[in-house]
């Protein structure tokens, strides 16, 4: 099955202090390689979450990424702050034998708007 990375929401709005889910699904787990979430694009993009075991404060996987056939790589960001605003990309990499992993496809991006906490 041909690989397609889908981020269904173009944008989401969340109040500061709340949590939000950023959805991402794949149509195939092949080629073998990790899935990572970034905020922003290019050289300045920031790694937000990687499904490879590292710990990321405030960010958790929504479904069991270790489960066979799991195609859901959505994440939940908790206790959102204004600094979390930006466009988030779900990115699929191909594992290299020795060289660094190669980015092969990205979702269309989901823009996160952080609203002021109602007083």
């Amino acid at each position: 099955k041909e690989l397609k990375v889908t981020q269904p929401e173009k944008s989401v709005s969340v109040a500061a202090g709340d949590s939000t889910v950023l959805n991402c699904t794949l149509t195939s787990l092949l080629p073998v390689g990790p899935i990572k979430w970034y905020r922003g694009v290019g050289q300045s993009r920031l790694l937000i979450y990687s499904f490879t075991g590292e710990h990321f404060p405030r960010v958790t996987n929504v479904s069991d990424a270790t489960k066979r056939n799991n195609m859901d790589f959505s994440i939940r960001i908790s206790n959102v702050t204004p600094e979390d605003a930006g466009t988030y990309y779900c990115v699929k990499f191909q594992k290299g034998p020795s060289e660094p992993d190669t980015e092969i496809q990205s979702g269309g991006g989901t823009e996160v708007y952080v609203l002021a906490k109602p007083s």
């Epitope: 270790t66 489960k67 066979r68 056939n69």
Partner: antibody, heavy 124, light 106 residues
């Protein structure tokens, strides 16, 4: 060496509850998904329940759905199966199993080690 | 449940294959040996073709399309047992085959 030691079996009353505990040693417990598998007398193997390595995700077989709870304590290297509203058909030897660095609960293709088993008899 | 033959037989020294089908579309297969009812099963193959360190190299596993195969080369009398395959179905639930009894002749 990897060891999985089950305890908590024995004679149980229909309608009652049981709690089985599996203690793992010889491996990094928190890195591996765990499953419970049972075998009724004269029958084949049946998957009961499973849990992801971090304990956040749990999975149950149809025969115990709604009656079973699987949990784990990675600090103590234990996994627990609680089964309520016991029936005669729950009579079986219950095995604790470890996944070998792949898969999660229910992914039986990943099982690489088994406990010795604990016998459960449900009878009045 | 997974589908596997009820029984197979072989003479010592021969090669025997046991097949298993019915797992989820992308799933792998594991193989478990049980020498007598009530004794703990032993994993001989997991994740299609991985072998635990204490299992002889005579045991191997493979997967083609959606069928898993356990191959035992140079079968020995001590290999006589019931072999179960295990996987997960498309819903993610764990499933076993009904077991294949291997009889070593002679």
């Amino acid at each position: 060496a990897v060891t999985l030691d089950e305890s908590g079996g024995g004679l149980q009353t229909p309608g009652g509850a049981l709690s089985l505990v599996c203690k793992g040693s010889g491996f990094t417990f928190s890195s591996h998904a765990m499953n419970w598998v049972r075998q009724a007398p004269g029958k084949g193997l049946e998957w009961v329940a499973g849990i992801s390595s971090d304990g956040r995700f749990t999975y149950y077989g149809a025969a115990v759905q709604g009656r079973a709870t699987i949990s784990r304590d990675n600090g103590q290297s234990t996994v627990r199966l609680q089964l309520n509203n016991l029936r005669a058909e729950d009579t079986a030897t219950y095995y604790c199993t470890k996944n070998g660095g792949c898969g999660s609960g229910g992914d039986l293709d990943c099982i690489d080690a088994w406990g010795h088993g604990t016998e459960v008899i449900v009878s009045s | 449940a997974l589908t596997q033959p009820a029984s197979v037989s072989a003479n010592p020294g021969e090669t025997v294959e046991i097949t298993c089908s019915g797992g989820g579309s992308n799933n792998a297969y594991g193989w478990f040996q049980q020498k007598s009812p009530g004794s703990a099963p032993l994993t001989v193959i997991y994740d299609n073709g991985k072998r635990p360190s204490d299992i002889p190299s005579r045991f191997s596993g493979s997967k083609s399309d959606s069928t898993g195969t356990l191959t035992i080369t140079r079968v020995q009398a001590e290999d006589e047992a019931v072999y179960y395959c295990g996987s997960a179905d498309n819903s993610g639930a764990g499933v076993f085959g009904a077991g294949t009894t291997l009889t070593v002749l002679g």
